[in-house]
């Protein structure tokens, strides 16, 4: 199974509606189905057309909380089972909570994607939010990864940083486990300096309404909301 | 696009003191850090303080705590710097600039200030 | 305070000669250096971002290293618009502070 079309992200205001495609292709034409933060999604309905060997599934939601939907495309060739998957999330517009309020715990990176990046033994921030925080952030971290080696050689290792730093945010441990956020400074320097043509492209889609998965990770948080390493060097994280 | 535009020349007597001004466009003024650098005739740069716009926090160099003071006002995107008991080594250009060292930098014209009797 | 020492204070030299301005950190500031340009009349230009990132736009003749406390600016082949001042910024911690700049001139 492949995925021809994956869904892309969006920025919505609370209580719209919002459409994700996702079109897969494989002998024999695939199955398709949804994930809402690591469970079968619970609410919106499913349409799926197939034509040709390809199978087009949209699935429509209406939106009253952020979350990740990963699009699964299965089939079965004699013996053998084929899956893709494709992820994006669902954010609301001024939606999201300060950090400390959000519900987690601290446990040991044991993903692959960020291996390179994050430090040996770091301890990450994992969100209950999700039903299977380690699988569905690894995932995010994946779907963005792949699409980050279309960008220039000086953006895509400050890219990645900034991502699986994003992502899996270092951990505070204590009574109330802590995601730290990046530095202000240094979503700036991938932003602006590192990453500045990619970050123009990404503007532009923004305006339009557009988001790519990986673009709109990039872009959350708004590096002005960050805390500064000069102003307060033990409430972020230096990459 | 980015622009930084600097109030005009000033000439100002010793023990006085001078505001200068930086009027922000083309950005979202609350979100990047305005720093203040100063280049005495024929001298190097030197680094007088920065402000947060959003909130208004600021840090300055030692030489001119006490003697310095840095505000924002949102409603009209500017920034302003104060410098109080001026003296004959306090004439220079003054530079308001966004974001030295780690976004994109621009540059507001500069403003001369010269401290005369 | 972090003390940066730039060597030398001036230079002269001819078109199409390697120059290497040296800038010294009183402590560590990791790579938390930027190069400026500064032509008479005119407001300084950023070249070098992060120590030996290059600015958009900046000729591939310049080039930055160094981490640390020891950092080099380095023209490859000088050209004529080359001959300016150049400052080197840490921007570690406040206060930050300008090394006390290099005057390039024709030899």
């Known amino acids: 199974a492949r995925i021809l079309r994956a869904p892309e992200s969006h920025n919505v205001t609370f209580g719209s509606f919002v459409t994700l495609h996702c079109t897969a292709t494989g002998i024999p034409v695939p199955t398709i189905t949804w994930i809402e933060n690591g469970n079968a999604v619970s609410s919106g309905s499913i349409q799926e057309s197939v034509k040709d060997r390809v199978i087009d599934s949209r699935l429509q939601l209406f939106i009253t909380k952020p979350g990740l939907y990963t699009c699964i495309a299965t089939n079965k060739h004699g013996e053998k089972f084929s899956t893709a998957k494709a992820a994006a999330t669902i954010s609301i517009a001024e939606w999201s909570k300060p950090q400390k309020d959000n519900k987690g715990y601290c446990a040991q990176y044991r993903g692959e994607v960020c291996n390179a990046v994050l430090a040996k033994d770091a301890l990450v921030f994992l969100n209950t939010s999700y039903a299977d925080p380690e699988e569905a952030q690894e995932l995010l971290v994946h779907t963005a990864w792949n699409e980050l080696k279309v960008v220039s050689p000086v953006c895509r290792p400050a890219a990645e940083a900034l991502l699986c730093n994003h992502i899996f945010q270092e951990c505070s441990p204590g009574v109330v486990p802590t995601p730290i956020p990046i530095c202000r400074e240094y979503c700036l320097a991938v932003k602006e300096l590192f990453c500045a043509k990619e970050w123009l492209v990404m503007e532009e889609k923004t305006h339009r309404g557009l988001y790519r998965s990986e673009m709109h990770l990039l872009s959350v948080p708004e590096c002005s909301k960050l805390p500064s390493m000069h102003w307060d060097p033990t409430a972020c994280a230096r990459l | 696009q980015v622009q930084l535009v600097q109030s005009g020349a000033e000439v100002k007597k010793p023990g006085a003191s001078v505001k200068v001004s930086c009027k922000a466009s083309?950005?979202?003024?609350?979100?990047?850090?305005m720093h203040w650098v100063r280049q005495a005739p024929g001298q190097g740069l030197e680094w007088m303080g920065i402000i947060n716009p959003s909130g208004g926090s600021t840090s300055y160099a030692q030489k001119f705590q006490g003697r310095v003071s840095m505000t924002s006002d949102t409603s009209t995107s500017t920034v302003s710097m104060e410098l109080s008991s001026l003296r004959s080594e306090d004439t220079a250009i003054y530079y308001c600039?966004?974001?030295?060292?780690?976004?994109?930098?621009?540059w507001g014209q500069g403003t001369l200030v010269t401290v005369s009797s | 305070d972090i003390q940066m020492t730039q060597s030398p204070s001036a230079m002269s030299a001819s078109v199409g000669d390697r120059v290497t301005i040296t800038c010294r950190a009183s402590?560590?500031?990791?790579?938390?250096l930027a190069w400026f340009q500064q032509k008479p009349g005119k407001v300084p230009k950023r070249l070098i971002y992060?120590?030996?990132n290059l600015q958009s736009g900046v000729p591939s003749r310049f080039s930055g290293s160094g981490s640390g406390t020891e950092f080099t600016l380095t023209i490859s082949s000088l050209q004529p618009e080359d001959f300016a001042t150049y400052y080197c910024l840490q921007h570690n911690s406040y206060p930050y502070t300008f090394g006390q700049g290099t005057k390039l001139e024709i030899k």
């Open positions: 402590q560590d500031i990791r790579n938390y």
């Open positions: 600039a966004r974001e030295l060292g780690w976004g994109s930098d621009y």
């Open positions: 992060i120590a030996s």
């Open positions: 083309g950005y979202t003024f609350t979100s990047y850090y």
